[in-house]
Interface confidence: medium
């Protein structure tokens, strides 16, 4: 339905607060380095323009397209090419190519400060004092930080990150009240921002066609009892959603958020009976917890999927006549079935039945070729199953930091090229899985490890992909989405690697470390040990194990030390030294 | 009792169009996806376009994509399909049908309305 005035449309559906507050996420992620005044002085000029529209939708500039309208205004910054370099070149292009160029260069790991939390009474003061002000800086810190982070979420995170201001200011103690809730929001955040970051990859990297054979796998497992054409329009809506976020269409895409959250609500009987409490939930609320929701029961009696999927005469007639609608339906099918499946395993299975009926139906009996395409299934749900197992056990056995380590060891030697940090981030998230996802019973582990493990090995993906150092890295990424994670656990030691010289300097601890969170300490010791893998690649666990726990000592005994910075420079010489002597460095 | 009437069938020449309509009554059809299929002479039967109870998502079979429109009118309980540059091997009875809730049977059949297209 076209409106004479797409800015004044989205300004009437969106109100004035939901829509000022996309605007400065939106220009937040695209300017990621302007400094928070320019983009609240950009978003005030937009809000009052819109304002005009919305009283006369013929006024002049009204007709004009959002990415005009916002694109315009981004390139009236004054220290564009000063600042961004290259990006400048955009505004020298037209619409849509300008939107374009703006989205090839959002970085997913700007050089901006680290977020360093004020003092409890600092920050209760700075949010009496201008509440819509701190509010703002939130959502400008966030956005800048997370060019892909889901627009309408973030809102929702607003929401209870003022929520939580407004209860602990007021409280007696007000930090003990305060600083967990910000934990809290900031893991969640993270997650968040790394679970939309795979759903923009997937379609930018990969097509709508496979974000839509996620969306059906993942939405059939969550509402069962759904016809599979219900789920199919879900799909469609939501596909529509996410390409908006990810585009940068944030006004539509939280318009469309809010319509098909209406739509779900609306027709709950013919989706899920686990819908009734988010349905009653405001706006926010409620589409986040549409998106959390419980799988419902799967209903009873379902038949057997060979009936129509293998042992049906029409089988090749049904792929042929409309091969997505057939392979969606086979999807659908086989994850209402499978809650305890992971997305990308039952993504797998698809592509192999795809795969069987591409080759079978031209054969001279099709159905004597596809008879046993079940059986294909049997290793494909085996490896993950193995892998998890495998890994929960070792989990169980080491505990989070030091399976962690073990992570840092296993991909440092796999991809040594890649750089430390990056290294250190990935597998410090990936040793996650475990206090994740380990606790759950057999039937909900899959879903929760192999897709947390596929939304982490993708910030690799991303961040490798802005400085590429690894071709073992990029064909894991490149080549299937659903293989991205078989891919990583297939890689054995790199042996085309040249170890990294040895450096003094990187070994080199000071006093500091003492002052640090655990978080922060840990981050040092793996940081370390990172360092100490790509200079001895074919150190043995033992080895490194032995250095290690040499190192966590001269750390505990130098931070007990009354001259803490000359014990680390004194002992410090002698735990280098006894460390190249026992890794033979 | 579940009843759906197509009409608008006829002899069209290759190049023309029709338009099928499809009266449905006896269930709720605001909440129903629905679909087109055909038989033609001597063959077995194809699906030709399927459409959400709102209205989109629609589906079509690849050989009819771009020339056929499926669309309904919840408010009439009627299911349409617009057919724009027939060709021969278009011939065929058309009926409309609910769509099948999961596996790959349809619940509700018209009694179908004969589509000729020849020169």
């Known amino acids: 339905d076209a409106h004479k005035s797409e800015v004044a449309h989205r300004f009437k559906d969106l109100g004035e607060e939901n829509f000022k507050a996309l605007v400065l996420i939106a220009f937040a992620q695209y300017l990621q380095q302007c400094p928070f005044e320019d983009h609240v002085k950009l978003v005030n000029e937009v809000t009052e323009f819109a304002k005009t529209c919305v009283a006369d939708e013929s006024a002049e500039n009204c007709d004009k397209s959002l990415h005009t309208l916002f694109g315009d205004k981004l390139c009236t910054v004054a220290t564009l090419r000063e600042t961004y370099g290259e990006m400048a070149d955009c505004c020298a292009k037209q619409e849509p190519e300008r939107n374009e160029c703006f989205l090839q260069h959002k970085d997913d790991n700007p050089n901006l400060p680290r977020l360093v939390r004020p003092e409890v009474d600092v920050m209760c003061t700075a949010f009496h004092d201008n509440e819509e002000t701190f509010l703002k800086k939130y959502l400008y810190e966030i956005a800048r930080r997370h060019p892909y982070f889901y627009a309408p979420e973030l809102l929702f995170f607003a929401k209870r990150y003022k929520a939580a201001f407004t209860e602990c200011c007021q409280a007696a103690d007000k930090a003990a009240c305060l600083l967990p809730k910000l934990d809290e929001l900031r893991d969640e955040g993270k997650a968040s921002s790394a679970k939309q970051r795979l759903k923009c990859a997937s379609l930018q990297k990969f097509g709508e066609r496979a974000f839509k054979a996620w969306a059906v796998a993942r939405l059939s497992q969550r509402f069962p009892k759904a016809e599979f054409a219900e789920v199919s329009k879900l799909v469609t809506d939501l596909t529509k959603v996410h390409t908006e976020c990810c585009h940068g269409d944030l006004l539509e895409c939280a318009d469309d958020r809010a319509d098909l959250a209406k739509y779900i609500c609306e027709n709950q009987d013919s989706i899920s009976s686990k819908l009734k409490e988010c349905c009653e939930k405001p706006l926010l609320e409620k589409s986040h917890c549409i998106a959390e929701v419980e799988n419902d029961e799967m209903p009873a009696d379902l038949p057997s999927l060979a009936a129509d999927f293998v042992e049906s005469k029409d089988v090749c007639k049904n792929y042929a006549e409309a091969k997505d609608v057939f392979l969606g339906m086979f999807l659908y099918e086989y994850a209402r079935r499978h809650p305890d499946y992971s997305v990308v395993l039952l993504l797998r299975l698809a592509k192999t039945y795809e795969t069987t009926l591409e080759k079978c139906c031209a054969a001279a009996d099709p159905h004597e070729c596809y008879a046993k395409v079940f059986d294909e299934f049997k290793p494909l749900v085996e490896e993950p199953q193995n892998l998890i197992k495998q890994n929960c056990e070792l989990f169980e056995q080491l505990g989070e930091y030091k399976f962690q380590n073990a992570l840092l060891v296993r991909y440092t030697k796999k991809v040594p090229q890649v750089s430390t940090p990056t290294l250190v981030e990935v597998s410090r998230n990936l040793g996650k899985v475990g206090s994740k996802c380990c606790k759950h019973p057999e039937a909900k582990r899959m879903p929760c490890a192999e897709d947390y493990l596929s939304v982490v090995l993708n910030q690799l993906c991303v961040l490798h992909e802005k400085t590429p150092v690894s071709d073992r890295v990029t064909k894991c990424c490149t080549e299937s989405l659903v293989n991205r994670r078989p891919c990583f656990s297939a890689l054995e030691v790199d042996e085309t690697y040249v170890p990294k010289e040895f450096n003094a300097e990187t070994f080199t601890f000071h006093a500091d470390i003492c002052t640090l969170s655990e978080k922060e300490r840990q981050i040092k010791k793996q940081t370390a040990l990172v360092e100490l893998v790509k200079h001895k690649p074919k150190a043995t666990k033992e080895q490194l194990k032995a250095v290690m726990d040499d190192f966590a000592a001269f750390v505990e005994k130098c931070c007990k030390a009354d001259d803490k910075e000359t014990c680390f420079a004194e002992e410090g010489k002698k735990l280098v030294a006894a460390s190249q002597a026992a890794l033979g460095l | 009792e579940v009843q759906l009437l197509e009409s608008g069938g006829g002899v069209v020449q290759p190049g023309g169009s029709l338009r099928l309509s499809c009266a449905a009554s006896g269930f709720t059809f605001d909440t129903s996806s629905m679909l087109w299929v055909r038989q033609a002479p001597g063959k077995g039967l194809e699906w030709v376009s399927v459409?959400?109870?709102?209205?989109?998502?629609?589906y079509y079979a690849d050989s009819v994509k771009g020339r056929f429109t499926i669309s309904r009118d919840n408010s009439k309980n009627t299911l349409y399909l617009q057919m724009n540059s027939l060709r021969a091997e278009d011939t065929a009875v058309y009926y409309c049908?609910?769509?099948?809730?999961?596996?790959?049977?349809?619940?509700?059949w018209g009694q179908g309305t004969l589509v000729t297209v020849k020169s």
């Open positions: 459409i959400h109870q709102s209205g989109t998502p629609t």
């Open positions: 049908a609910k769509f099948p809730s999961s596996r790959m049977k349809f619940d509700y």
